[in-house]
């Protein structure tokens, strides 16, 4: 007899040969799987799965919980299924009350029916409350009711599956929907301080705050240009439903100079990433750097005001500041303040206010500042510009007329002869001798100049003018003399101020 070549393997047959079967509660379920290569029966409902290696599945007294899909599988991996409803008027719904939905995705409210012939299978709000207007759902008696495109606003929504059984509305146990938000923006990251300055051995601690809609945001501290895993500690809070905050604190208990660098707090979610950086500078010891805000050599006119201003960087923070002049410390007339209120600030300003300076108040003004590690100072050389003052004007025994003037800058002395009684002297007279008397004396204050002319050069009655001047102003002194015969009888010196 010719051999028959076997065809393609076929799926098993099930008796009764139906896709669905309705059994009353308490009655028997008897399912037969017909296949020469029978392997097993599998029962599935909600998250429950049972297996049976017998080719006949028998449940003597059916319960509502026996409602579900029965699948017979053969050795070829082919299968056939039948769905059995166990109708129980006291238990219309099978429920798995866990209900999670991802925002913008569909989610299944698992409340399959035990009776496919009920009507108005739908969702209802708890306590009769209306469901959200935009909530759409699709019922499936074998699986439950699918909520379409879950919204964030549905979080904590209380609902029931509902169906009309013999003209009466029946509700399932209640479900509370928990919505997992979708990431629709990158995380928000911020850092406690943008920069840190420490001395060796001090503790470095910096906190990154990460804000997002859920705790599944990822975050880490990274060292730029380094793969080393950093030690960090976390604290986190939920401020309401979709407002999560995490604080990631990075600590280096004893910072070293080579720990200096840029540290990045990085966070990402499925939408994207964000980062923020902080800079650490570790120095072996503290420092002070002073920057004058005006020239350290200052020229000021007599009677005017001047402000000596410095900015300085000090780390650690300054402990002592003072302004000194002629070994005397100013107790007032100065102020010292931080350049900014930022807690990272290391820059400060100090101002000394000198008012109505006198010619005698020129000199070196010194600002001194110190912290726990170093001292620093800066000096200002203050020159007070003064109008010349004629100190002496005499006729010497040797016939010389001598004028001595003091002022700053160094005065120039010019001589003029005025014939007769005029006091407008135009004819200049060259001095015989000019000396700066205190050029080698103290570096500040007035400079004294002495100038002499020979009076024997004058043959007529008249007045001699000694005029001392500099950039600030001028002052004159006059010598009146007359001839009696061939003798110069008298010389009356007097001054005339010329502004």
């Amino acid at each position: 007899q010719p051999s028959v070549s076997p065809g393609e393997p076929s799926p098993p047959s099930i008796h009764p040969a139906k896709s669905e079967l309705i059994v009353r509660v308490g009655n028997e379920i008897r399912l037969l799987c017909i296949d020469p290569g029978f392997v097993k029966w599998t029962f599935e409902i909600l998250d429950e799965t049972n297996e049976n290696k017998q080719n006949e599945w028998i449940t003597e007294k059916a319960e509502a919980t026996n409602t579900g899909k029965y699948t017979c599988t053969n050795k070829h991996g082919l299968s056939s299924s039948i769905y059995v409803f166990v109708r129980d008027p006291a238990k219309l719904f099978l429920v798995d009350r866990s209900l999670y939905g991802k925002e913008d995705n569909d989610t299944l409210v698992r409340c399959p029916l035990t009776d496919p012939e009920v009507t108005s299978y739908s969702l209802k709000g708890c306590q009769g409350k209306p469901l959200p207007k935009d909530l759409r759902f699709v019922p499936d008696p074998k699986a439950g009711i699918t909520i379409k495109s879950v919204k964030r606003a549905y979080h904590r929504l209380c609902l029931h599956c509902s169906a009309d059984q013999e003209g009466k509305s029946v509700l399932s146990d209640k479900f509370i929907l928990k919505v997992r938000p979708a990431f629709k923006a990158v995380p928000v990251v911020s850092v406690s301080k943008a920069s840190y300055l420490l001395r060796e051995g001090e503790e470095f601690t910096v906190t990154c705050t990460i804000k997002d809609v859920s705790s599944s945001v990822y975050s880490t501290w990274k060292r730029e240009n380094s793969q080393t895993k950093l030690q960090e500690k976390y604290n986190s809070w939920h401020h309401g439903d979709f407002n999560y905050e995490r604080q990631a604190t990075l600590t280096i208990s004893s910072a070293r100079v080579n720990d200096s660098g840029v540290f990045m707090c990085y966070a990402n979610n499925t939408f994207g990433s964000a980062n923020v950086t902080t800079t650490l500078e570790v120095v072996d010891k503290g420092f002070i750097n002073i920057f004058p805000m005006i020239n350290t050599t200052v020229f000021v006119n007599d009677g005017e005001n001047v402000d000596l201003i410095v900015e300085y960087e000090a780390f650690p923070k300054p402990e002592h500041q003072q302004w000194i002049y002629m070994n005397r410390t100013f107790t007032d007339k100065w102020e010292d303040y931080p350049k900014s209120e930022n807690e990272s600030n290391i820059r400060y300003v100090s101002e000394l206010h000198l008012t109505r300076l006198k010619g005698t108040e020129g000199g070196t003004y010194t600002f001194l500042v110190s912290n726990s590690d170093v001292n620093a100072s800066i000096a200002f050389n203050v020159y007070v510009n003064t109008k010349p003052e004629i100190l002496t004007y005499d006729r010497l025994v040797n016939g010389m007329l001598q004028c001595v003037a003091a002022g700053f800058p160094e005065p120039t002395i010019d001589w003029y002869f005025c014939p007769g009684t005029e006091q407008r002297c135009s004819a200049s007279v060259l001095p015989v001798d000019v000396q700066t008397l205190n050029a080698s004396g103290p570096p500040f204050g007035k400079l004294v100049v002495q100038s002499s002319i020979d009076s024997s050069a004058f043959k007529h009655n008249g007045t001699v003018e000694c005029k001392a001047y500099n950039d600030v102003g001028k002052t004159s002194a006059y010598f009146n003399f007359a001839f009696k015969g061939n003798n110069k009888e008298q010389i009356h010196p007097h001054t005339l101020f010329t502004p």
Partner: antibody, heavy 116, light 108 residues
Amino acid sequence: QIQLVQSGPELKKPGESVKISCKASGYTFTDYAIHWVKQAPGQGLRWMAWINTETGKPTYADDFKGRFVFSLEASASTAHLQISNLKNEDTATFFCAGGSHWFAYWGQGTLVTVSS
Amino acid sequence: SYELIQPPSASVTLENTVSITCSGDELSNKYAHWYQQKPDKTILEVIYNDSERPSGISDRFSGSSSGTTAILTIRDAQAEDEADYYCLSTFSDDDLPIFGGGTKLTVL
């Protein structure tokens, strides 16, 4: 069928208290909230409060906090509204309502008259 | 405070169609429900969830919603439709109910 049946009319003096009731039948009492609604003579409907029949927790409208107590007697499928220190302006018909969509079914109303 | 605005009165000749409006800022995302109060004070729900009709309510009653306005339409108006009609919706995250001011419908 679902029914909400309210207690009868009340005549009270200012300063007194009144307690009116709303008995539900035809459904599982704890499935649906009970709402209370006030209608003053010649006026429209004003929602006062709803009470969660599962937990007993009331949720009030701002104007009905203080003198108004909303309570349940779940074993008797009954909700109560008590008003203390009655005022002339409390004269009104009070309705209870409930059902599968909040105000699906209404009681017949209870007239409370406050008069000295 | 939140309000639902209804016209105080409306009229319709017998067997004609009338529409009553209810306006409120939240109505684009909250359902409107409609209630009929007869002269004897009895109250009946005629429309829920914008457009659903409870069993036992005549199909002459219909509801719709567009933007911030909900509409109750009564076609083929009958003498027994003469009543006050109230819309109701909810407001705030707590879904607190609020009624419109009511519309007195006269059937001529």
